[in-house]
């Protein structure tokens, strides 16, 4: 028969900094050998070469050395491409072209996404506030993609739409920083919430500020960090926010700033003697030197790893001193599950089959749910195992044993409990003798 090249109909959603698999499969004829195979991945629009396999050999990446095939799976018809450290610029359509004797191609879309950080809220003016004063509340959320939707509401959940100005600016990596400004007249007290939504990830990041007029300042060095854990995706950069209140006339020469791991007290990064003393943590940390004088002691942690998860203490000493701890919660999304069936040929009603649902490289451990075509949960005869690789990421394999009816759909949902991200796969088995896999 003809060479059939298959790719997913839906776009592959990949998080910036993570690896993505662009799935592509073909149907090899009996007796097929890799010496016969020509495989080309290219950008659909510009036809720029991305990766190729020819003359029985992987010819390598022509795309910034960030692509790889799965050489051990090629002979079985798996022509998928692994794209490492995804960037915003990678978004678009990739064509998988396979030529043996016959040839065929199909295009798969890559949709890039990056979650927005928990918004930081600033108030202007922020001192001696009284009912009736007009204040400007700025909600800032960073390093997301694509552009965000921003919503404001009051303490009762009523939307605030008037006097809102939102701007979004892309940085050199193409990630957006969003700044939304709300101007309000203060009541006796009030809570103002800002919600930043990533339309692709359907991820909401929110923060609120409660303004109680007539707060008295303490005069002490006040070190402030976010109450909620900072959620960072493996491979991306994270900002551990920390701010302090500099006194008038404060100079950086007076500042001692130390970031350390809360539990072990291991030094992470420091600033003293008027100078950034650099990273003591695998050279993956940086301060924001231009912002220190304004009281911004935040720490940038690059290429986040699972092992980074935990509590970091920000210690500020000028004349007075203070500290606060911020938690880093590491996460990695699970891949779209792949489904396998055993046995996978000549299936008939009454046969017992084993359906395996596999999802890869997520963190933390996943929750796995099975259900039938009517959405009824399947809990009996399910065995789930999760194994961490050397980077601490989990591969999850869940096995369901079922007796086939006349026909049936079996769905597997792999949930990341931190990202509240669901990845699902399903298989439909029809009653007449059939061969797996059908297209899900």
């Amino acid at each position: 028969g003809a060479l059939e090249v298959q790719v997913p109909e839906d776009p592959v959603v990949a998080l910036v900094g993570t690896d993505a698999t662009l799935c592509c499969s073909f149907s090899p004829e009996p007796g097929f050998s890799l010496a016969q195979l020509n495989l080309i991945w290219q950008l659909t629009d510009t036809k720029q070469l991305v990766h190729s396999f020819a003359e029985g050999q992987d010819q390598g990446s022509a795309y910034a050395n960030r692509t790889a095939l799965f050489p051990d799976l090629l002979a079985q018809g798996n022509a998928s491409l692994r794209l490492q450290r995804v960037r915003v610029a990678d978004e678009g359509s990739f064509t998988c072209f396979v030529s043996i004797r016959d040839f065929g191609s199909a295009a798969v879309s890559l949709q890039v996404a990056a979650p927005y950080s928990k918004p930081s809220m600033t108030l202007e003016p922020n001192k001696d506030l009284r009912p009736g004063d007009t204040v400007t509340i700025t909600c800032s959320s960073y390093q997301g993609y694509p552009e965000a939707e921003v919503f404001w509401q009051d303490g009762q959940g009523v939307p605030l739409t008037g006097n809102v100005t939102t701007s979004q600016m892309a940085n050199e990596q193409g990630l957006f920083d969003v700044h939304s400004i709300l101007r309000v007249v203060l009541g006796a007290n009030g809570t103002y919430s800002c919600l930043v939504r990533n339309p692709v990830l359907q991820q909401d990041a929110h923060s609120s500020v409660t303004i109680t007029p007539q707060r008295s300042p303490t005069g002490a060095v006040e070190v402030q960090v976010p109450e909620d854990p900072v959620v960072a995706l493996v491979g991306t950069d994270a900002t551990l926010r920390c701010s302090f209140s500099p006194e008038p006339g404060f100079s950086l020469a007076q500042l001692n700033l130390i970031w350390q791991l809360t539990d072990t007290k291991q030094l992470v990064h420091s600033f003293t003697e008027g100078r950034d003393q650099g990273s003591a943590y695998a050279n993956r940390t940086a301060l924001f030197p231009d912002l220190l004088a304004q009281g911004n002691a935040s720490l940038r942690l690059q290429r986040v790893r699972v092992a980074d998860e935990g509590s970091f203490t920000c210690f500020v000493s000028i004349r007075d001193f203070g500290s606060a701890a911020v938690s880093l919660q590491v996460a990695a999304p699970y891949s779209k599950p792949s489904m396998t069936l055993e046995p996978n040929k000549d299936l008939r009603p009454g046969d017992t089959v084993t359906i395996t649902c596999s999802s890869y490289r997520g963190y933390p451990e996943a929750e796995v749910f099975w259900q039938d075509g009517q959405g009824v949960p399947l809990t009996g005869n399910v065995t789930t195992s999760q194994m961490a690789n050397e980077q601490g990421l989990f591969d999850v394999h869940s096995v369901l044993r079922v007796v086939l009816g006349a026909n049936g759909t079996y769905s597997c949902l792999v949930r990341n409990p931190v990202l509240q991200q669901d990845a699902h796969g399903s298989v439909t088995i029809t009653g007449q003798p059939m061969t797996f896999p059908p297209e899900a």
Epitope: T218, G219, A220, V221, E222, V223, Q254, N256, I258, Q260, K265, L267, S270, T272, E273, Q277, T313, F315, S317, I318, R319, D320, F321, G322, S323, A324
Partner: antibody, heavy 116, light 108 residues
Framework: GASVVESGGGLVQPGGSLKLSCAAS????????MSWVRQTPDKRLELVAT????????YYPDSLKGRFTISRDNAKNTLYLQMSSLKSEDTAIYYC??????????WGQGTLVTVS | DILLTQSPASLSVSVGETVTITCRAS??????LAWYHQKQGKSPQLLVY???NLADGVPSRFSGSGSGTQYSLKISSLQSEDFGSYYC??????????FGGGTKLEIK
């Protein structure tokens, strides 16, 4: 001039509790971090607790965490150290000292705590 | 915690001589180091802060130097009131800010 005066020391049995006080005068106490430092019979100095100017942040060596509590009352210009589950190795002269960022300037004359 | 090692532990010298006491830190303390003098039966008195700065009222025969992990206190032309014990203390990082073991200076 500036001075700090410790009080509350004395003889206590093992397992007992004691609360030390330190009265400050002659400087703006409410803007200074403060520490309790002890000097053991072998003359070694050990910082046992530190508190920042508004009392929000407190620090202890891991070995003493849970047994000692430092606190302050800025309205009264007074620093406190609550000690519980005392052991013989807590026998020392306890000094109250300022901890202004990178310098320790004002020290008291000390109060003797004997656990026996 | 950072360990401060003082040397020598004791020394015996005559009035008018010059002595140097050293303090080695187990890691860089970035000049956040103080020196104290303690006379028998008295509380410690601050001599030097941030490694090189003399505290108010301290005679100029005392001088502090050093950086990184190595620091020293030099006393030129020793006077009788200079005898007693000397301690270093760092103020780097999150407390506890530890002390050196002390140096006992005796009259020969």
């Amino acid at each position: 001039g500036a001075s700090v005066v410790e009080s509350g020391g004395g003889l206590v049995q093992p397992g007992g509790s004691l609360k030390l006080s330190c009265a400050a005068s002659g400087f703006t106490f409410s803007t200074f971090g403060m520490s309790w430092v002890r000097q053991t019979p072998d003359k070694r100095l050990e910082l046992v607790a530190t508190i920042n100017s508004d009392g929000v942040n407190t620090y202890y060596p891991d070995s003493l965490k849970g047994r000692f509590t430092i606190s302050r009352d800025n309205a009264k210009n007074t620093l406190y150290l609550q000690m519980s589950s005392l052991k013989s190795e807590d026998t020392a002269i306890y000094y109250c000292a300022s901890a202004e960022g990178r310098r320790g300037a004002y020290w008291g004359q000390g109060t003797l705590v004997t656990v026996s | 915690d950072i360990l401060l090692t003082q040397s020598p532990a004791s020394l015996s010298v005559s009035v008018g001589e010059t002595v140097t006491i050293t303090c080695r830190a187990s890691e860089n303390v970035y000049s956040n180091l103080a020196w104290y003098h303690q006379k028998q039966g008295k509380s410690p008195q601050l001599l030097v802060y941030t490694a090189t700065n003399l505290a108010d009222g301290v005679p100029s025969r005392f001088s502090g130097s050093g950086s990184g992990t190595q620091y020293s206190l030099k006393i030129s032309s020793l006077q009788s009131e200079d005898f007693g014990s000397y301690y270093c203390q760092h103020f780097w990082g999150i407390p506890p800010w530890t002390f050196g073991g002390g140096t006992k200076l005796e009259i020969k």
